[in-house]
Interface confidence: medium
C-alpha cells in the first residue's frame, strides 16, 4: 500500500528556496511525479486540513503542517500524476499528460535554528501588562513576509522601535537582530531596511489602515535573550529611525529556469519575483559557482557545471539583476534597462 | 481584491471569427495562470484554453488549430482568438485567473469573471 503516511514512503517539495514549502513531488514507479491537486476527487482550488500531511512534514524535518492546496502553475513539463481513493494515498494514479495540472503545495513550519523565547515571560514586579510580549513585522509591499518595520507588544502597549546611529555603533554584531527574527520564526537576520523602503514599500491601503501606534520603545539591552528584557518605553517622536529587518526567511523567494538550451538543464537563466519572467543579468558580485549551484539545484538538475556571460553590445538588451551572491538572499530584484549581459548556464543532466 | 471581467462576445455565423478579452485588475502581482473555461446550456463548464505566466498554452482537444490564446502580462490581460467558429461552439465563456494571494508565496486562489455570450448561428 502507497501512502504519504508510510514512514518509507519518499516525498519531497519543490519549486522553493526553502526545503519545508513547495509543489508536492512523490517518487513512485522509479522517478519523481508532481501530484496535481485534482487528485482524490477533490476540485483544484479546494484547500485540505494540512494536518493531514503531518507526517510528510515530519519525516522532511519541518515542523508542523501550515497548509496544503493549489500551488503556482509550472511552465516546465514534468511527470504530473492525478491520484484517486483516499486523500495521500497512491496506488492508484494516472499520468495527466496533457491536462492543466495545478500542482499540490504544501507549507510546513520551517524548524526553529534557536531555542524559541519563552512562551510567558517570569513574572515581573509590576502587575501590568499580563499578556505575554510578542513581536510582528508590519508587512510590505506585495504582502512580503519577514520583512518590514518592528513593532513590539507588551499587554496592549505596542509601538515601533527607535532605532538610532548611536544603536548601530553599540550593535556591530547584530546579535539582538538576530533574536528578533528567530522569535519572529523568520530565520536570521540579513540586512536593515532603510526607512524609505520600509515605509514605501507598504501598500498605500495598508498604510491608511495602519495607524501610529499610540507609544513607541527604545533598545534596552541588545544581547537580550527574552523579549521583555529587550526594550523600554519612550515618549513617542516625529523624527528619526525605526527598527525595520529583513530575515532570510522573506518571502517571496526568487524563482529562476533556464530557457533557450537543448535540455532543461542548460540554458540562459531566467529570473521572477512576482508574475513577470525576465533575463538575469550578469552581475560582478556573483563571480562564485554559489549562484549557479543554487540556480541547478532549483532546476531539480545535477551540480553546476559552467557559465557563459553572453555579449552585452545592445543598448536595449533589459533584465533583473541581483546585487547578492545567491538569488535565494535577494530581496530584490533592480531592473536593468540596457546593457543587460544574459547569462548562459550548463548544469549536470541527471537523466542524460 | 481582484475583479475578473470578459468582454468581446455576440453572434456570429459559423466560420466566422471573434475575439475574446479578459482583464484582471485588483491585486493581481502574482497571477499564474488565465483559463478560458465554456459552459453549453444543461452541460458542465469545461476549460477550453490555458495560458501560464511563462507561455506554455494548453487546449481542449475540439478547439485545437481554431482557437488561440494569448496574453498580454503587462495589462493583466488574456484574449481568445477564436476562428472557424461552429454552433457546437455555443456556449457562455468564462474567463479565470488564478493568482498568489496578496504574499505571492505560491498558494493559488481563483477568481472567475461573469462570463461573456457567445452565440454561432448555422
Known amino acids: 500500500r502507497l501512502s504519504w503516511d508510510d514512514p518509507d514512503f519518499q516525498t519531497r517539495l519543490t519549486r522553493s528556496n526553502s526545503r519545508c514549502q513547495g509543489q508536492l513531488e512523490v517518487y513512485i514507479k522509479y522517478g519523481w511525479h508532481m501530484v496535481c491537486s485534482q487528485s482524490w476527487g477533490r476540485s483544484s482550488n479546494q484547500w485540505e486540513d494540512p494536518n493531514q500531511a503531518s507526517k510528510v512534514c515530519q519525516r522532511l524535518n519541518c515542523g508542523v503542517p501550515l497548509s496544503l492546496g493549489p500551488f503556482l502553475i509550472t511552465d516546465r513539463h514534468q511527470s504530473q500524476i492525478t491520484c484517486y481513493g483516499r486523500l495521500g494515498s497512491f496506488s492508484n494514479c494516472s499520468h495527466s499528460g496533457r491536462d492543466v495540472c495545478r500542482p499540490l503545495g504544501l507549507t510546513c513550519l520551517e524548524p526553529q535554528t534557536t531555542t524559541p523565547p519563552p512562551t510567558r515571560p517570569p513574572p515581573t514586579t509590576t502587575p501590568e501588562p499580563t499578556a505575554p510580549p510578542r513581536l510582528q513585522l508590519v508587512a510590505q509591499a506585495a504582502g512580503r513576509h519577514c520583512a518590514g518595520v518592528v513593532e513590539f507588544y507588551s499587554g496592549s502597549l505596542g509601538g515601533t522601535i527607535s532605532y538610532e546611529a548611536q544603536d548601530k555603533a553599540q550593535d556591530k554584531t547584530q546579535v539582538l537582530e538576530n533574536f528578533l527574527c528567530s522569535s519572529l520564526q523568520c530565520g536570521s537576520f540579513l540586512k536593515h531596511l532603510p526607512e524609505t523602503e520600509a515605509a514605501t514599500a507598504q501598500d498605500p491601503g495598508e498604510l491608511r489602515e495602519h495607524q501610529p501606534l499610540p507609544i513607541q520603545w527604545t533598545i534596552r539591552n541588545s544581547s537580550c535573550t527574552s523579549l521583555e528584557h529587550c526594550f523600554r518605553k519612550i515618549k513617542p517622536r516625529n523624527s528619526g529611525q525605526v527598527l525595520a529587518l529583513l530575515c532570510s526567511g522573506f518571502q517571496p523567494k526568487v524563482q529562476s529556469r533556464l530557457v533557450g538550451g537543448s535540455s532543461i538543464c542548460e540554458g540562459t537563466v531566467e529570473v521572477r519575483q512576482g508574475a513577470q519572467w525576465a533575463a538575469l543579468c550578469d552581475s560582478s558580485s556573483a563571480k562564485s559557482s554559489l549562484r549557479w549551484e543554487e540556480v541547478c539545484q532549483e532546476q531539480q538538475c545535477g551540480s553546476f557545471n559552467s557559465y557563459q556571460a553572453l555579449d552585452a553590445g545592445d543598448p536595449t538588451s533589459r533584465g533583473l539583476s541581483c546585487p547578492h551572491q545567491k538569488l535565494s538572499q535577494c530581496h530584490e530584484l533592480t531592473e536593468r534597462k540596457s546593457y543587460c549581459k544574459k547569462v548562459f548556464v550548463t548544469c549536470q543532466d541527471p537523466n542524460p | 481584491e481582484v475583479q475578473v471581467v470578459e468582454s468581446g462576445g455576440g453572434l456570429v455565423q459559423a466560420g466566422g471569427s471573434l475575439r475574446l478579452s479578459c482583464a484582471a485588475s485588483?491585486?493581481?502581482?502574482?497571477?499564474?495562470?488565465m483559463y478560458w473555461y465554456r459552459q453549453a446550456p444543461g452541460k458542465a463548464r469545461e476549460m477550453v484554453a490555458a495560458?501560464?505566466?511563462?507561455?506554455?498554452?494548453y487546449y481542449e482537444d475540439s478547439v485545437m488549430g481554431r482557437f488561440t490564446i494569448f496574453r498580454e502580462n503587462a495589462k493583466n490581460t488574456v484574449y481568445l482568438q477564436m476562428n472557424s467558429l461552429k454552433p457546437e461552439d455555443t456556449a457562455v465563456y468564462y474567463c479565470?485567473?488564478?493568482?498568489?494571494?496578496?504574499?505571492?508565496?505560491?498558494?493559488?486562489?481563483?477568481?472567475w469573471g461573469q462570463g461573456t455570450q457567445v452565440t454561432v448561428s448555422a
Open positions: 485588483g491585486d493581481t502581482i502574482c497571477i499564474s495562470a
Open positions: 479565470n485567473a488564478d493568482i498568489a494571494g496578496h504574499n505571492c508565496s505560491g498558494y493559488l486562489k481563483e477568481y
Open positions: 495560458i501560464t505566466s511563462g507561455g506554455s498554452t
